[in-house]
């Protein structure tokens, strides 16, 4: 992956580093869940950071069917009020009151899979979400925190002399900018927008002529990326033998 | 997609000069910086130095201060470096490259000999 | 000068094999660099980009990472017309300097 400015050469490197990002489902499969059982259902809340635009699916606990009375999901998005969708086995009806997402849904009929999906996240899918299965031993929760991850754009450019400027553009939750090698660099800007992103700005210059070309790093929970680009020579300078 | 052609081989005697040449297409020449690199005969590569066509700044590696010289054409697309005094141990294959070292030349060889 | 230390300068390894070179730079400077491969006759091939980048038409075995300050180039399983010397190259700093090479032979 290449890109390329007017004034300069700006090369891109996305690295292969991708985290707990692979897999958009928690749910384990009928093996694991009796290995596991106990533990499980201990895992009360789980916090999970999830790609946005990709799919998620959300479990509840491992209760056998034969067991349910009643399966609730309870979904509480930042600034909307509660929605719940509630399946009762014995009736099989199925309610919803208050959800208005058309991306969230069941997997399939709630009497064949309780899990709960959203097809695709988005950025307003932040919030938590919780299963509750009332059987007549009591009531089993699963609770999930659910990150949005937004990618930052990243870009790199030379805005004055020997001074570069990085910026990850509209990244959830903020992306760490570093650079190679390190330069004089001024105090890192972060710009948040409405939607919950941030924009994170570093500015840095490089006094020593001997430094030829500079990287950007950008670290963040959905990858990281690296631009580079070599400085343009000081105006006036004609000729360098070795400066350093 | 960025080319630079450099012809296959240069012949010439000891103590004289040659100048190299290396024709650029794909890409905004005057911006990007066009780099040279020595290779002799199943050995490593060295680093001689560069231009910014856009301006004629250079910097040499201070092995090559006195032997290479760096420049450009912009009309003709080309930057050119000249060899002097030449000695076998002169006798290499020569690389321009350029977009921070991802696009080069297929080398010109040079031959030193009487 | 920022020194290129390359290891190993010589390997032999059998077809399917996974292979692993490294550069460091001198004193531990951090820099970025790319990976080549050259063939006998031939110019420099581009396989690695800026330390990870994978350049297009190369095969998906070759990868590169940078640990710290060092820096990996992996063949997963080598192949035949794997055989070549390979060399890293440090852009960060003025001179540009390379790794000594690493000749990759086939067992």
């Known amino acids: 992956e290449g890109a390329a400015q007017s004034n300069n050469s700006l090369m891109l490197q996305t690295s292969k580093e991708n985290h707990t990002l692979a897999s958009n489902s928690l749910c384990m499969d009928e093996k694991q869940i009796t290995q596991n059982h106990s533990k499980v259902l201990a895992e009360v809340n789980i916090s999970w950071p999830v790609q946005m635009a990709r799919n998620a699916v959300l479990c509840c606990p491992p209760i056998e069917f034969r067991n349910l009375i009643v399966i609730t999901w309870e979904i509480i998005l930042r600034g909307q009020p509660s929605c719940t969708k509630s399946y009762r086995k014995e009736t099989n009806e199925t309610k919803e009151t208050n959800c208005t997402d058309e991306r969230i849904t069941w997997v399939s009929t709630p009497d064949q899979n309780s899990d709960l999906q959203i097809h695709p996240v988005a950025i307003t899918h932040d919030g938590y979400y919780r299963c509750i299965m009332a059987t007549p031993d009591g009531n089993f929760h699963r609770g999930y925190h659910l990150q949005v991850l937004v990618t930052p754009e990243v870009t790199l450019f030379e805005s004055r002399n020997r001074t570069a400027v990085c910026k990850a553009v509209a990244g959830k939750p903020a992306a760490q900018i570093s650079w190679i090698p390190a330069g004089d660099c001024a105090p890192t800007e972060q710009e948040y927008w409405g939607n919950g992103t941030v924009t994170v700005k570093s500015t840095c210059h490089w006094e020593g002529h001997n430094v030829s070309t500079v990287t950007c790093h950008v670290s963040h929970l959905t990858g990281n990326k690296s631009l580079y680009i070599e400085l343009l020579p000081v105006p006036g300078a004609k000729k360098s033998a070795k400066l350093y | 997609q960025v080319q630079l052609q450099q012809p296959g081989s240069e012949l010439v005697r000891p103590g004289a000069s040659v100048k190299l040449s290396c024709k650029a297409s794909g890409h905004t020449f005057t911006s990007y910086w066009m780099h040279w690199v020595k290779q002799r005969p199943g050995q490593g590569l060295e680093w001689i130095g560069n231009?910014?066509?856009?301006?004629?700044?250079?910097n040499y590696d201070e092995k090559f201060k006195s032997k290479a010289k760096l420049t450009v054409d912009t009309s003709s697309r080309t930057a050119y470096m000249q060899l002097s005094s030449l000695t076998s141990e002169d006798s290499a294959v020569y690389y321009c490259l350029t977009m921070t070292g991802t696009s080069w030349g297929q080398g010109t060889l040079v031959t030193v000999s009487a | 000068d920022v020194q290129m230390i390359q290891s190993p300068s010589s390997l032999s390894a059998s077809l399917g094999d996974i292979v692993t070179m490294t550069c460091q730079a001198s004193q531990g400077t951090p820099i970025n660099l790319h990976w080549f491969q050259q063939k006998p006759g031939k110019a420099p091939k581009l396989l690695i980009s800026g330390a990870s980048n994978l350049e297009d038409g190369v095969p998906s075995r070759f990868s590169g990472s940078r640990y710290g300050t060092a820096f990996t180039l992996t063949i997963s399983s080598l192949e035949d017309e794997d055989m070549a010397t390979y060399f890293c190259?440090?852009?960060?700093?003025?001179?540009?300097?390379f790794g000594g090479g690493t000749k990759l032979e086939i067992k």
């Open positions: 190259l440090q852009f960060t700093y003025i001179p540009w300097t």
């Open positions: 231009i910014y066509p856009g301006s004629g700044s250079i």
